[in-house]
């Protein structure tokens, strides 16, 4: 899987949308995890509702919120009040029993507010970064690589 790079301004919110095949992942919960090192395990941050029919309800862990539109095939993660420590590599996952299929890898980069930094120079900030849910720049996108599970009875 290629990695999507998203940038957000410190102190603002960053919204991540991971799309998936709604039929293939029908009935599966989703999770957002933080990868510990390049080849290390992925530590669960937050997962969607324990009742799949209620996946659209927002679930929160600290400043991270997740909700899943299972009909559209889009799981949305919002990192609120972004901090420098939130920078790093994350994964959107689809859960099936104890197995987790990676839907998307996301590299989160946190930009310091130029107004707070005299040496910021000519750092370009996207126009939408002033919105509460904004401050996201997608530098590269990739189609999700399909990983198939063996059929279950």
């Amino acid at each position: 899987l290629n990695t999507t790079v998203l940038q957000g301004m410190a102190g603002q919110s960053l919204r991540v949308s991971c799309t998936y095949d709604a039929l293939k992942h029908w009935g599966r919960r989703k999770a957002w995890c933080r990868q510990l090192g390049e080849e290390g395990p992925c530590q669960r941050v937050v997962s969607t509702h324990g009742v799949w029919l209620l996946a659209f309800l927002k679930k929160r862990n600290g400043s991270t919120v997740i909700a899943d539109d299972t009909l559209a095939g889009t799981v949305t993660i919002t990192l609120k009040n972004l901090q420098a420590g939130d920078a790093g590599l994350y994964q959107c996952q689809s859960l099936r029993g104890r197995e987790a299929e990676v839907l998307q890898k996301v590299l989160v980069e946190v930009l310091e507010d130029p107004l707070d930094d005299q040496d910021a120079g000519d750092l370009w900030v996207p126009e939408e970064s002033s919105s509460f849910e904004g401050a996201q720049v997608e530098h590269s996108t990739s189609r999700n690589q399909e990983t198939s599970f063996p059929p279950t009875s």
Epitope: A22, L23, W26, G27, H49, G50, V51, W52, L53, L54, F56, L57, K58, K59, R60, A67, T70, L71
Partner: antibody, heavy 128, light 107 residues
């Protein structure tokens, strides 16, 4: 207004199958903004959620762990109703059984899930 | 399953009293909690959903609060029709569960 009308036998023999039906008026069993539940109540176990069914481009059901191996909830779209089947019953399954609509709060990213409309209840006794 | 523990299991109160019922979850459930009222021989009736939202048609003397593991149902001024059994219910877990109930009786 939305109403749920339950029907089914009040006496079932041990080891047999308990079958109840819940007829919906004023809403659709295929609605994507609701789920359809079975809940039971007994003096020994109190209120116990058994499971629900909902339509999200196709039918999906979820069951309580305690009855997962014995329960089936099915929709009947032609009659706008849904049913409960509980296999291999024992006297411990004696209870008042309710059907209920599980409703979602406001959109988008709706707030909450709750049982807002209930059937009248059916006392089912498991005895030989 | 998540266990829901209500306290007290019963209480005696007079008309006009302020009544508080608590519900504790065995693990954090955010605000995924509802409150119901049940009278003998009747189905439960929804009062409060998502911890603090008053269901349409329910009198404003009923209110709910709490988040995480500790929740409260308050009746600000008890009325004769409020004598009943009250239940909390969580929907965080794949097996939704109810509390054992709190019976509010006339003193």
């Amino acid at each position: 207004q939305v109403q749920l009308q339950q029907s089914g036998p009040g006496l079932v023999k041990p080891s047999q199958t308990l079958s109840l039906t819940c007829a919906i008026s004023g809403d659709s069993v295929s609605s994507s903004s609701a789920a359809w539940n079975w809940i039971r109540q007994s003096p020994s176990r109190g209120l116990e959620w058994l499971g629900h069914i909902g339509y999200r481009s196709k039918w999906y059901n979820e069951y309580a762990v305690s009855v997962k191996s014995r329960i089936t909830i099915n929709p009947d779209t032609s009659k706008n109703q849904f049913s409960l089947q509980l296999n291999s019953v024992t006297p411990e399954d004696t209870a008042v059984y309710y059907c209920a609509r599980g409703m979602y709060g406001s959109v988008p990213y709706k707030e909450g899930y709750y049982f807002d409309i209930w059937g009248q209840g059916t006392l089912v006794t498991v005895s030989s | 399953d998540i266990q829901m523990t209500q306290s007290p299991s019963s209480l005696s109160a007079s008309v006009g009293d302020r009544v508080t019922i608590t519900c504790r979850a065995s693990q954090g459930i955010s605000s995924d909690l509802n409150w119901y009222q049940q009278k003998p021989g009747k189905a439960p009736k929804l009062l409060i959903y998502a911890a603090s939202n008053l269901q349409s048609g329910v009198p404003s003397r009923f209110s709910g609060s709490g988040s995480g593991t500790d929740f409260t149902l308050t009746i600000s001024s008890l009325q004769p029709e409020d004598f009943a059994t009250y239940y909390c219910q969580q929907y965080t877990d794949e097996s939704m569960t109810f509390g054992q109930g709190t019976k509010v009786e006339i003193k």
